[in-house]
């Protein structure tokens, strides 16, 4: 697989390829899940339509020491135009519900699959 921009990548792959690779990684996580993902860590739920990639990264970046989602975190950083650090959470997003990382990944995966089917790569 071509490495995604955001972690020592030589250049961005086409958006359709980038989205497909992110979907494949999320599928990987959900299929290989044996014990509770990231020890059942909780993250903020996000609006999956508004500025979704940065919002997803802001939520997941606060999970540390979970190797299962490290690649997803790196991939999402390539999808976000600004730098995101742990502890940052934009006022543009509502913080009202926390969900398990496993549920977050499933929700994100379902939404990305829908976007891919509809050809919304951007």
């Amino acid at each position: 697989l071509t490495c995604l921009g955001g972690f020592a990548s030589p250049g961005p792959v086409p958006p359709s390829t980038a989205l497909r690779e992110l979907i494949e990684e999320l599928v990987n996580i959900t299929q290989n899940q044996k014990a509770p993902l990231c020890n059942g860590s909780m993250v903020w739920s996000i609006n999956l339509t508004a500025g979704m990639y940065c919002a997803a990264l802001e939520s997941l970046i606060n999970v540390s020491g979970c190797s299962a989602i490290e690649k997803t975190q790196r991939m999402l950083s390539g999808f976000c135009p600004h730098k995101v650090s742990a502890g940052q959470f934009s006022s543009l997003h509502v913080r009202d519900t926390k969900i398990e990382v496993a549920q977050f990944v499933k929700d994100l995966l379902l939404h990305l699959k829908k976007l891919f089917r509809e050809g919304q790569f951007n």
Partner: antibody, heavy 118, light 109 residues
Framework: EVQLQQSGAEFVRPGALVKLSCKAS????????MYWVKQRPEQGLEWIGR????????IYDPKFQGKASITGDTSSNTAYLQLSSLTSEDTAVYYC???????????WGQGTTLTVSS | QAVVTQESALTTSPGETVTLTCRSS?????????ANWVQEKPDHLFTGLIG???NRAPGVPARFSGSLIGDKAALTITGAQTEDEAIYFC?????????FGGGTKLTVL
């Protein structure tokens, strides 16, 4: 006060290599993505690429792959753009810009004029 | 690669409201394009105005606002002033790279 101070104008021969610098003051470059943008006379802006100075991770526009190399030095708070195998097509003004949290490209350098001519 | 299109030139009068738009060649502009608006004044003076569709940069006058109108991103200047005469560039983020529009030359007469 936030400032991006770019290196001076360059006049170089075709085939040469040049390294432009962008020294930041008033903030830490490791806290932001730093971008480079090209502007040719009477043309629009072209995005070259970005760097995360904290870890050196970069992304380039495919058009500039193999042509541009972006690096950063957090100790001197400086971002660099190296351009190789220069041709007349590389004659342009090059800008560095800071990208803020949720945008925009809020602070820009004053630009470095690069002229490639024999 | 996508092409981003802007009006090449617009003219307005002081006090009037003017809207500049930014169209994507590959469909509707959404919040996931993180639309940016940048102002260029003479002598290569660039200033970032709006990020992420409608996020105004600190210090930018409130008369500048960003939005989505129909399938495009838009920059509205409510009550234009003579000092707003400039070239305005929009930029759209396509998953992992930026594409700039050609710029709109705004004249305030």
């Amino acid at each position: 006060e936030v400032q991006l101070q770019q290196s001076g104008a360059e006049f170089v021969r075709p085939g040469a290599l040049v390294k432009l610098s962008c020294k930041a003051s008033g903030f830490n470059i490791k806290d932001y993505y730093m971008y480079w943008v090209k502007q040719r006379p009477e043309q629009g802006l072209e995005w070259i690429g970005r760097i995360d100075p904290e870890n050196g991770n970069t992304i380039y526009d495919p058009k500039f792959q193999g042509k541009a190399s972006i690096t950063g030095d957090t100790s001197s708070n400086t971002a660099y753009l190296q351009l190789s195998s220069l041709t007349s097509e590389d004659t342009a003004v090059y800008y560095c810009a800071r990208y803020a949290y949720y945008g925009p490209f809020d602070y820009w350098g004053q630009g470095t004029t690069l002229t490639v001519s024999s | 690669q996508a092409v981003v299109t802007q009006e090449s030139a617009l003219t307005t009068s002081p006090g009037e409201t003017v809207t500049l738009t930014c169209r994507s060649s590959i469909g509707t502009v959404t919040t996931n394009n993180y639309a940016n608006w940048v102002q260029e004044k003479p002598d290569h003076l660039f200033t970032g105005l709006i990020g992420s569709t409608n996020n105004r940069a600190p210090g930018v006058p409130a008369r500048f606002s960003g939005s989505l109108i129909g399938d495009k991103a838009a920059l509205t200047i409510t009550g234009a002033q003579t000092e707003d005469e400039a070239i305005y560039f929009c930029a759209l983020w396509y998953s992992n790279h930026w594409v700039f529009g050609g710029g709109t030359k705004l004249t305030v007469l």
